[in-house]
Interface confidence: low
Amino acid sequence: QPSVSPGEPSPPSIHPGKSDLIVRVGDEIRLLCTDPGFVKWTFEILDETNENKQNEWITEKAEATNTGKYTCTNKHGLSNSIYVFVRDPAKLFLVDRSLYGKEDNDTLVRCPLTDPEVTNYSLKGCQGKPLPKDLRFIPDPKAGIMIKSVKRAYHRLCLHCSVDQEGKSVLSEKFILKVRPAFKAVPVVSVSKASYLLREGEEFTVTCTIKDVSSSVYSTWKRENSQTKLQEKYNSWHHGDFNYERQATLTISSARVNDSGVFMCYANNTFGSANVTTTLEVVDKGFINIFPMINTTVFVNDGENVDLIVEYEAFPKPEHQQWIYMNRTFTDKWEDYPKSENESNIRYVSELHLTRLKGTEGGTYTFLVSNSDVNAAIAFNVYVNTKPEILTYDRLVNGMLQCVAAGFPEPTIDWYFCPGTEQRCSASVLPVDVQTLNSSGPPFGKLVVQSSIDSSAFKHNGTVECKAYNDVGKTSAYFNFAFKGNNKEQIHPHT
């Protein structure tokens, strides 16, 4: 019993003055608490608590369930306790069958004894099965049996508390150990889509999946750089013992442009945190942006092929695409396809395949595309390079020799005189007149050039060469001169 020092509050005293008391079932329990400032008796066993404001606690007919700790408290908050065992051969254990252990922590099998004098107080496996080899425990008759450092492998382990009574083993009711796993890794988080593009008024909904060993994992959707609480809905599942999954769905029923931004799904447990983000872009209306993959001015040689290629971004999805030339729509020779098979793809490719182009097929080729909100177009100017063709070569009545040639780019015409019958003409002759005939005509056709020289300058037999050339090639025509006396007898043009 505590000693009393004058002037200093002391704990109450209890009669009988011992720390433990053993009574037989059916006997009376009579406990007296002596203290000038008595407040209450408290009885505790397992999770049950009872209070009594009388300074004498009397239980006329004791039962096994009256086993427990009786504490007397005074007004100074000081207390004293006695532990009472009510020995009942028919009920050796008081039991709270709930048994939950946190991994790596100790947990108590709550089977306190009603008789402290029984022997070999220990744990046994159900149906004679042995306990796990590494399971260590410490028995305490007043509290139960403490399992040290619970392992995840002990989950759903079936146990009995056991004692020996009169040479026989007596088992308690069975306990099933449920292990609450410790977090040994950060949660695994994933998001249904990494980015979203929406028009104003459309619904934004994104789901974050959080996986961990137990439901104690914390998760939330956050808007980056904002403290606003977001509205989420949850679904959760236990797939087996240590495989928990939660789906947190964030919804904005009618998205606005200022809802655009980065949303983070954040999860943490006692081990650490993990996060994943998704980007929302809300536009006030749809759009189409076209990007030519080649120069919009194209030069191609006669008879060659060319591919006109565009990439374009379209949101919402493109509905109509066409290629047009000279007010005619192509029904074939082109293809249109998404740049990626990704669900959130907004980029597309369109290709027009022009084969064996003729000189007459230059011009403006236009790609048009539209969706439910906008139209867009891009034009390619295609120039077909052609070797010059000499259209006419004549002696005019005024004595002029005239050569007319067509090609693209614009041909140049040079004149040469060859004495005698040679056709390797070297001496150049300056033209009297050079004209480009169709500069005011269509911009993509062949360009026609006319050049003239004065034939009176030639005094000897010979050949005059008209040579038309450009970057693609050259073509020549020839005029033959023959003199009889002082007269030019004849001029024979030939190529």
């Epitope: 608590t49 709270d96 137990s214 439901s215 949850y234 236990h238």
Partner: antibody, heavy 123, light 107 residues
Amino acid sequence: QVQLVQSGAAVKKPGESLKISCKGSGYRFTSYWIGWVRQMPGKGLEWMGIIYPGDSDTRYSPSFQGQVTISAGKSISTAYLQWSSLKASDTAMYYCARHGRGYNGYEGAFDIWGQGTMVTVSS
Amino acid sequence: AIQLTQSPSSLSASVGDRVTITCRASQGISSALAWYQQKPGKAPKLLIYDASSLESGVPSRFSGSGSGTDFTLTISSLQPEDFATYYCQQVNSYPLTFGGGTKVEIK
């Protein structure tokens, strides 16, 4: 003995607020989850949510998330269910119940029930 | 959320009859199922927890069985005080849903 005692019946108008209580005794209040269950007239039981008074860990049914708030005062062994703006459809009997000790509140069962609080919302 | 479907929704029986009520879960819930009895104007009362464990003080004529998705509550010999509504509840994962109830009436 172990018991839960709920506050008395309440008659309210739509839009008003209300907080009903559930007081536990005869056991260690902080060691057990306390759940709330709704029963509309002539209908079945609906699980609303649950709180662990020891640390105020709270879980809600998606149907009731944002509609009600569950809280607890552990020093006075009392759990609460509150509405900030009542609707006529909130008219029902509300029960609190102790959830037998469980790993994260998943196991065990409602072993002790309060007597129920009738909430009537009418204009 | 896990759905619980109780059948039948109501039944008529006589004193002494054997009565069986079933509860089916939309996904596996191991043995995490409880059964309750509710009489008019009263709070529900726990009968069975862990699918088959009889709550203290509940008469032994009540028994529960099943695991996974299919569960049964059996009253071996119906007594006058057993006429009531019976509910199952899953306690495997949030939200902790109830079945729709089975009303046992006097034939």
